[in-house]
């Protein structure tokens, strides 16, 4: 197995991953196997109604660039704190001995797995578009359930990250075969998203590819500037009783998605009004209604607020509302 | 593809109670209400209520309010509309759809449920 | 008074054109809502036909023709489905519906037919 292996995002889009050779492999390493999904945002994060009170808003960071070669041991997946900067104990000969065992170990159950969990595949000649693996069987192990990947759907249910269908782990993944390093820059990723990356150490490229167990690790891209910004303008109608229906567009591509909305609002010369739009009253009125305004002059701006904080503010949408008792209801506003 | 599939034609006797179906698929369930709409024979349209599977917050037309309970289970991306205790009048065909605040308004809708009330 | 009203019927010839009415009641504006226009055939649901709120901001629905399109009689406080070219197959149930005040209303429908 590929050991410590390290993945960071030192972009929107990309994401590095460096690993170390296995201490005890079986013959030469003579390649290595990458393979990445896109994880789904967790279901919770959709349904949940971040204006109420008490509620904390979500948080996701992206994974940190590399502090030094050395310095970060683990997987640092988005849940993770880094370590603080400690320096390890020397070691007893009892844990030498322990760590001789488990390599000696390693290696027999490694053996085991080669030869009855996994049964070799012949070798397919692969674009790197997807898994070229489909005589590859894996035995059932309990632990590899349904993955959900976003895909685009009707223009009716506009966000990618509205739809999401569950897919055979190993059916369509993109992939890339390493040779002669232990590092790989994953790009062509989406913003602001998690990512599960396998990745296999491999002692035979043809005819039959032997390839270790998988080690996994989980990565998230860093945000993109502006794609939490509202683009298109803000809107308004002005109902019967001054109720006024402001309106926007949902930013198209968030980073991961969007939690909520904020409108502020003001009457010329008082003070600045804040209202909070979950996404689900969103969904019922593409937007929000203001509603008991007093007669005057309105300015208001809106920003949306992803998993990874807080878009731009729109510029200032401005209306004026009358006093409704002096004017007849057909006239168009 | 993005579609809402109802549960079979029912044949009730009134005061019996009665649960029908709609489930969701090829989109993100939890995300958008969801609608009823009744149809009575040889009458027009009548909105019902909606439903948002995220939280359950339901929404009843004023006509409907407390005619009917509407529910959903969104671990297998089904709304229901139920009654306690059936009328005749509630024979009708009942629709569900998804429900867009603009752009879409109710779209798709499902094929149709038919409650048939009679003794 | 119903707050969207339809003309219950409404026959034309075919070739001909068709218009369709949904008037609001007195004391909503026609200008400030969506009108969404949907067809049903007997025996299926409603389909989608169009949206319309002012010639900038309209759409009509995947596979619908070109002959169908929408409009606003201020005026009158209407919302208008027009039909051009008439075909037997258009023959079928009208209705408008708006978004008021956080619920769906429909019109009563209009049975529209080809002769």
């Known amino acids: 197995v590929p050991l410590d292996p390290i993945s960071v995002s030192n972009s929107s889009s990309q994401i590095i991953l460096k690993w170390k050779p296995p201490s005890d492999p079986n013959g030469n390493i003579t390649h290595y196997l990458v393979f990445w999904e896109r994880q789904a945002e967790d279901s919770e994060l959709f349904e949940l109604d971040y204006c109420l009170k008490g509620l904390k808003l979500p948080s996701r960071t992206w994974s940190p660039p590399f502090e030094s070669e050395d310095s970060q041991k683990h997987n640092q997946s988005e849940y993770e704190d880094s370590a603080g900067e400690c320096c390890s104990c020397p070691k007893t000969d009892s844990q030498i001995l322990k760590e001789l065992e488990e390599s000696s170990f390693r290696k027999t159950f490694e053996d085991y797995l080669h030869n009855v969990v996994f049964v070799p595949r012949k070798t397919s000649s692969g674009t790197g578009a997807e898994d070229p693996r489909p005589s590859r069987k894996r035995r059932s192990l309990g632990d590899v359930g349904n993955v959900t990947v976003a895909v685009p759907t009707v223009a009716a249910f506009p966000n990618t990250s509205s739809t999401s269908v569950p897919t055979s782990p190993e059916e369509h993944r993109p992939f890339e075969k390493v040779v002669n390093k232990e590092s790989l820059v994953i790009s062509g990723l989406r913003h602001f998203t998690g990512y599960r990356i396998e990745l296999q150490a491999c002692n035979q490229d043809t005819p039959e590819e032997r390839c270790s167990v998988a080690a996994y690790v989980s990565a998230r891209t860093m945000p993109e500037a502006k794609a939490d910004d509202i683009v298109g303008p803000v809107t308004h109608e002005i109902f019967e009783n001054n109720v006024v229906h402001l309106m926007w567009q949902e930013p198209k591509e968030p980073n991961g998605l969007i939690v909520l909305y904020e409108v502020s609002y003001r009457r010329y010369g008082d003070e600045e009004l804040h209202l909070c739009v979950s996404r689900k009253h969103f969904a019922l009125e593409r937007g929000c209604r203001l509603r008991g305004l007093s007669p005057g002059n309105y300015s208001v701006r809106i920003r949306a607020t992803s998993l990874a904080g807080n878009g731009s503010w729109t510029e200032p949408t401005y209306f004026y509302v009358t006093d409704y008792l002096d004017v007849p209801s057909n006239i168009a506003k | 593809e993005v579609q809402l599939v109802q549960s079979g034609a029912e044949v009730k006797k009134p005061g019996e109670s009665l649960k029908i179906s709609c489930k969701g698929s090829?989109?993100?369930?939890?995300?958008?209400?969801i609608g009823w709409v009744r149809q009575m024979p040889g009458r027009g349209l009548e909105w019902m209520g909606i439903?948002?599977?995220?939280?359950?917050?339901?929404r009843y037309s004023p006509s409907f309010q407390g005619q009917v309970t509407i529910s959903v289970d969104k671990s297998i991306s089904t709304a229901y509309l139920q009654w306690s205790s059936l009328k005749a009048s509630d024979t009708a065909m009942y629709y569900c759809?998804?429900?867009?605040?603009?752009?879409?308004?109710?779209?798709?809708w499902g094929q149709g449920t038919l409650v048939t009330v009679s003794s | 008074q119903a707050m969207l009203t339809q003309p219950a019927s409404l026959s034309a010839s075919p070739g001909a054109s068709a218009s369709l009415t949904c008037t609001l009641r007195s004391g909503i504006n026609v200008v400030a809502y969506n009108i969404y226009w949907y067809r049903q055939k007997s025996g299926s649901p409603p389909q989608s036909v169009l949206r319309?709120?002012?010639?900038?901001?309209?759409?009509?629905d995947s596979g619908v023709p070109s002959r169908f399109s929408g409009s606003k009689d201020v005026s009158a406080n209407a919302g208008i489905l027009l039909i051009s070219g008439l075909q037997s197959e258009d023959e079928a149930d009208y209705y408008c519906l708006i978004w008021h005040n956080s619920a769906w209303v429909f019109g009563g429908g209009t049975q529209l037919t080809v002769l």
């Open positions: 319309y709120k002012s010639d900038s901001d309209s759409e009509r």
């Open positions: 090829g989109y993100r369930f939890t995300s958008y209400w």
């Open positions: 759809a998804t429900h867009h605040a603009s752009g879409r308004g109710l779209d798709p």
């Open positions: 439903i948002y599977p995220g939280d359950s917050d339901t």
